[in-house]
Amino acid sequence: APVPPGEDSKDVAAPHRQPLTSSERIDKQIRYILDGISALRKETCNKSNMCESSKEALAENNLNLPKMAEKDGCFQSGFNEETCLVKIITGLLEFEVYLEYLQNRFESSEEQARAVQMSTKVLIQFLQKKAKNLDAITTPDPTTNASLLTKLQAQNQWLQDMTTHLILRSFKEFLQSSLRALRQM
């Protein structure tokens, strides 16, 4: 499992380091989740050939995973702190159902999948403290999520493997874009 936030998973940590700022804590939390995703992707790619599949675009279109777009205000051109923060939180909330789906998809990395899910919940809490306009954040409908989960779990084995691969890849990319945007806030 990756080193929990607050400890340094890298080679050299500076001695006598000042306490982490809120931004640095969020940064560290995202890195922790990304480390977890890397481990899960390793298992997925070793177990199946999904990571090289050319049919992924087909499956991706049916998933509707959160993505950053220009209008979200997270890119340099048209950067808007509040709009972007709302997008990041909304996107993470939308990813939660997909992270729930991942929970029974791993054999050797079961704990890792749970760690990614729980760490994401913590990240959402960190970010909600940072947001001024919580009313603008739309929470996904639990009933819709439940039926989506059922639908995903009813897929054949090949589609389930593909779905797992696409969720991990999209979540990684969403977090990377979020990390870069959050640094500017």
Epitope: K10, V12, A13, A14, R17, T21, S23, E24, D27, R31, L34, K67, M68, E70, F75, Q76, R169, K172, E173, Q176, S177, L179, R180, R183, Q184
Partner: antibody
């Protein structure tokens, strides 16, 4: 071992368009940001801009009106175009990879000279 | 833009010396700073990221410290292969900006 190989015209006349391409070998194109950085002779480094595999770009405002960075995911390549070049654009141009922090992998550099 | 100022712009040192290079940002950048080494006619090479984390394969005589606006790169015992130019770079915001460089020469 990920490597970046870059190429393009090395000698241009003023007002022409600089065009460089960078290919990624031995690694994934997705999930990274791909930048262009330049270094005029005997001077420091200047970041030009970057592209994500999805095609979203960020540019240095000082060059934005003249720069286009594009991507060809099918070939694992990204390109730089800099229009209306002048002698001030004479530099070594590097492509580089960035994930979360630093530019951890660099191309070999291409010397571009603008001269009439 | 965030300005990055390095000092000194050049220094002379001997093999075995302890060398310190400083980098100052015009505004706070937390610990989002990288250090690079560049040798003549070569591309820069990443040494340190996140102000103090060593890139894999970089000798432990290199270390980085600092947070906010003031940062330091230290070479604990200078080796012949360390004579080069060193650059700091911030990645808190756009555009990414570099220091002007510090050239480490043989005394």
């Amino acid at each position: 071992q990920v490597q970046l190989q870059q190429w393009g015209a090395g000698l241009l006349k003023p007002s022409e368009t600089l065009s460089l391409t960078c290919a990624i070998y031995g690694g994934s194109f997705r999930g990274y940001y791909w930048s262009w950085i330049r270094q005029p002779p005997g001077k420091g480094l200047e970041w030009i801009g970057e592209i994500f595999h999805s095609g979203s770009t960020n540019y240095n405002p000082s060059l934005k009106s003249r720069v286009t960075i594009s991507v060809d995911t099918s070939k694992n390549q990204f390109s730089l175009k800099l229009s209306s070049v002048t002698a001030a654009d004479t530099a070594v141009y590097y492509c580089a990879r960035e994930e979360l922090d630093d530019f951890d992998i660099w191309g070999q550099g291409t010397m571009v000279t603008v001269s009439s | 833009d965030i300005q990055m100022t390095q000092s000194p712009s050049s220094l002379s040192a001997s093999v075995g010396d302890r060398v310190t290079i400083t980098c100052r940002a015009s505004q706070g950048i937390s610990s989002w700073l990288a250090w690079y080494q560049q040798k003549p006619e070569k591309a820069p090479k990443s040494l340190i990221y996140a102000a103090s984390s060593l890139q894999s394969g970089v000798p432990s005589r290199f270390s980085g410290s600092g947070s906010g606006t003031d940062f330091t790169l230290t070479i604990s015992s200078l080796q012949p292969e360390d004579f080069a130019t060193y650059y700091c770079q911030q990645y808190k915001s756009y555009p990414r900006t570099f220091g002007q460089g510090t050239k480490v020469e043989i005394k």
